[in-house]
Interface confidence: medium
């Protein structure tokens, strides 16, 4: 087993706004990670880099630095937010996301995250990829794990 375990838990919330003129959707997506330190010494979570893809196009990126220190045999839950923009060649999605006749406007996004930890004099990078449902039609708060998109493309834990 890894001495550092990173588990992508899921989307915590998604807040939506629109630019009617530009037919653009802005989605602020907050994700949750569990990082477990299985060592007998503290490790530093140096940075988290994340990106979100829709239909194989990167629609948002984020980076957090100097995040936290995790004690021996301890776990921390970390939330990080990725601002995303669905626009231009994907502006056709604006019609779907603002359609009043349907209640839930779920789109499938691919969440990619890389956690860099430092300990014992070296850095270790651990990456995760998950497909998630996000409602682009309203502000939504999710139960952890509720937004998971189970699909053959979904990488195994």
């Amino acid at each position: 087993p890894r001495s550092i375990d990173v588990k992508y838990i899921g989307v915590k919330s998604a807040y939506v706004s629109y630019d009617v003129q530009k037919r653009t959707i802005y989605l602020n997506i907050t994700n949750t990670l569990n990082i477990t330190n299985n060592n007998y010494y503290s490790v530093e979570v140096e940075n988290i880099t994340a990106q979100v893809q829709f239909s194989k196009t990167v629609i948002g990126k984020a980076r957090l630095n100097n995040i936290t220190i995790i004690g021996p045999l301890d776990m921390k839950q970390i939330d990080y937010t990725v601002p995303t923009v669905i626009a231009e060649e994907m502006s056709y999605m604006y019609d779907f996301c603002t359609l009043i006749s349907i209640k839930v406007h779920n789109i499938v996004l691919m969440m990619q995250v890389t956690v860099t930890t430092t300990y014992f004099g070296h850095s270790e990078q651990i990456s995760q990829e998950r497909y998630q449902y996000v409602d682009c039609g309203r502000n939504t708060t999710y139960q952890l794990g509720q937004s998971e998109y189970l699909n053959v493309l979904q990488p195994q834990q």
Epitope: Y41, P72, Y119
Partner: antibody
């Protein structure tokens, strides 16, 4: 003062399981790790595993994986070790001890030990 | 796993003697932060093990100054300057740096 009070001696039938307790007092329970150690007559000390009572995260000696299960109850400041599928090889004295998170102090205070005898 | 080799297995002594017990690990016990988790314990029959030395050379509270620890990296020594009757028993070193923690095989300090 720091004390680790362990449960009493156990006489157990082979194939069954036993749960040994270790009640901590005199310090902040979740600020220290709890270690478990085995001592058989005529043999040396054997490290079983360790638990962080605050997070519940454990680390085991490979030899004791599937044999020992470590848990902790923060509300009662008590750590537990369950031993399953007992055989005569599990007859031993089992000790709990605490270790400091931050300093290099490993197993500074120890429980009095719990004797487990496996016999039919 | 880290192998911790303790020598000698048995140490016959007379009261007043000075003795050394050696502990050697298969890998360095110093971590990135410069900490070395190497402890020494005395275990007497019918009692709980008692911590004597931690972090190579730090005496635990209440431990007499006739006990001293030294060493670095992979080689460590426990010295007892003047043996007293209460010092008889099994001595163990423990490495706590790497997973899993491992004890040395023990050294029996007994009267000649």
């Amino acid at each position: 003062q720091v004390q680790l009070q362990q449960s009493g001696a156990e006489l157990i039938r082979p194939g069954t399981s036993v749960k040994v307790s270790c009640k901590a007092s005199g310090y902040a329970f979740t600020n220290y790790l709890i270690e478990w150690v085995k001592k058989r007559p005529g043999q040396g000390l054997e490290w079983i595993g360790v638990i962080n009572p605050g997070s519940g995260i454990t680390n085991y000696n490979e030899k004791f994986k599937g044999k020992a299960t470590l848990t902790a109850d923060k509300s009662s400041s008590t750590a537990y070790m369950q031993l399953s599928s007992l055989t005569s090889e599990d007859s031993a004295v089992y000790f709990c001890a605490r270790s400091d998170f931050i300093t290099t102090v490993v197993a500074d205070y120890w429980g009095q030990g719990t004797t487990v005898t496996v016999s039919s | 796993d880290i192998v911790v080799t303790q020598t000698p297995l048995s140490l016959p002594v007379s009261f007043g003697d000075q003795v050394s017990i050696s502990c050697r690990s298969s890998q360095s016990l110093t971590n990135y932060y410069g900490n070395t988790y190497l402890s020494w314990y005395l275990h007497k029959p019918g009692q709980s093990p008692q911590l004597l030395i931690y972090g190579i050379s730090n005496r635990f509270s209440g431990v007499p100054d006739r006990f001293s620890g030294s060493g670095s990296g992979t080689d460590f020594t426990l010295k007892i300057s003047t043996i007293k009757p209460e010092d008889l028993g099994m001595y163990y070193c423990l490495q706590g740096t790497h997973q899993p923690r491992t004890f040395g095989g023990g050294t029996k300090l007994e009267i000649k």
